[in-house]
Interface confidence: low
């Protein structure tokens, strides 16, 4: 019979013959012959591969360096790869999630707007007229001001987005 | 007193590559700064490489991305290497130092440069 | 993409005058903004940053202007030490970019 110039899914074509892929989770010991289908192996300990393959080598696991602030999200099988993620207060820098970054802290006269997750960073926001924020912080958000009125008091500082107001007693008309 | 400063630019033929260094001084890289390369071609403009953070987390630019490659090689050192130069590689290349932290990313301290040329 | 978009790439003006920058993000990035001079074979120096903050040293002549995606540095009084090229850069985010930088503006003062 003529042989094959192209092959069906999960068979690739070598010495002019259509041989069987390997699964999910196995590696490619020898190709098949006239006489013997392709012969596999599962993939040992800490490795795996990911898709129908003809790799003569398993892929490593991904190592999640806790000296780069990483730990495992999900631990990987034969078929899947470990999934890191970043340590509390540490952000990845790629989707890949190969290394950590430390959050962003938010500057006096600015709050926290969205807080820091495992992959992305801490987005904030200026303190609008009313509130206020006085601390560098990765979580805090802007403050409103002190209500002065609410406790009989009067302002005697204004507030700033830095800080609060200072609220004291009224002055009392002597008699 | 502070300083950063950068060595290992050179005139080379395209198809060499090169490891530029970025040496800091008066301060610690192991502190909570980003240092970034950043290149200028001859009349042209800035353009950002990337960053390493002081664990060794980077940052690149999409088209330096798997192309350069930035490492912190002790604690005062910062490399850029850069393979399979070409023309377009002609700059010069600086190193900033970033602050985090402080609620943005800017480069508030930079080297002097050191010129790559890259022509047959 | 994050892209920093400045506007014009050449103004002239005369000392004592006033000029204006103008640079656009493709997308939101609060305040998160700064501004640098660079003179021929010189780094760049930080001249503002949160937008409108002064770095250390630097004159009031220079301002710093606006939010979201939409910012303006305005030279005031102008003097010939003024006259260099100015970048703006986003400070939002690392994140899937291709230049945190601005084109530049290049400015003569006559």
């Known amino acids: 019979p003529e042989p094959p110039t192209a092959c069906r899914e999960k068979q690739y074509l070598i010495n002019s013959q259509c041989c069987s892929l390997c699964q999910p989770g196995q590696k490619l010991v020898s190709d098949c012959t006239e006489f013997t289908e392709t012969e596999c192996l599962p993939c040992g300990e800490s490795e795996f591969l990911d898709t129908w393959n003809r790799e003569t080598h398993c892929h490593q696991h991904k190592y999640c360096d806790p000296n780069l602030g990483l730990r495992v999200q999900q631990k990987g099988t034969s078929e899947t790869d470990t999934i890191c993620t970043c340590e509390e207060g540490w952000h990845c820098t790629s989707e890949a999630c190969e290394s950590c970054v430390l959050h962003r802290s938010c500057s006096p006269g600015f709050g926290v707007k969205q807080i820091a997750t495992g992959v992305s960073d801490t987005i904030c926001e200026p303190c609008p007229v009313g509130f206020f924020s006085n601390v560098s912080s990765a979580f805090e958000k802007c403050h409103p001001w002190t209500s002065c009125e609410t406790k009989d008091l009067v302002v005697q500082q204004a507030g700033t987005n830095k800080t609060d107001v200072v609220c004291g007693p009224q002055d009392r008309l002597r008699a | 007193q502070e300083q950063l400063e950068e060595s290992g630019g050179d005139l080379v033929k395209p198809g060499a590559s090169l490891t530029l260094t970025c040496k800091a001084s008066?301060?610690?890289?192991?502190?909570?700064?980003?240092m970034c390369w950043v290149r200028q071609a001859p009349g042209k403009g800035l353009e950002w490489i990337g960053c390493?953070?002081?664990?060794?987390?980077t940052y690149y630019a999409s088209w330096a991305k798997g192309r350069f490659t930035i490492s912190k090689t002790s604690p005062t050192t910062v490399t850029l290497q850069m393979p399979s130069l070409t023309a377009a590689d002609t700059a010069t290349y600086f190193c900033?130092?970033?602050?985090?932290?402080?609620?943005?990313?800017?480069?508030?301290?930079w080297g002097p440069g050191t010129l790559v040329t890259v022509s047959s | 993409a994050l892209v920093m978009t400045q506007t014009p790439s050449s103004v002239s003006a005369a000392v004592g005058g006033t000029v204006t920058i103008n640079c656009q993000a493709s997308?939101?990035?609060?305040?998160?903004l700064s501004w640098y001079q660079q003179k021929p074979g010189q780094p760049p120096k930080l001249l503002i940053y949160?937008?409108?903050t002064l770095a250390s040293g630097v004159p009031s002549r220079f301002k710093g202007s606006g939010s979201g995606t939409q910012f303006t540095l305005t030279i005031s009084d102008l003097e010939c030490a003024d006259a260099a090229t100015y970048y703006c850069?986003?400070?939002?985010?690392?994140?899937?970019?291709?230049?945190?930088f601005g084109g530049g503006t290049e400015v003569v003062v006559k």
């Open positions: 390493i953070y002081a664990t060794g987390g």
């Open positions: 850069q986003q400070g939002y985010t690392y994140s899937s970019v291709d230049n945190v």
């Open positions: 900033a130092r970033d602050i985090v932290g402080d609620n943005i990313y800017y480069f508030n301290f």
């Open positions: 008066g301060f610690d890289l192991s502190s909570t700064y980003y």
């Open positions: 949160l937008a409108s």
């Open positions: 997308q939101t990035i609060s305040n998160e």
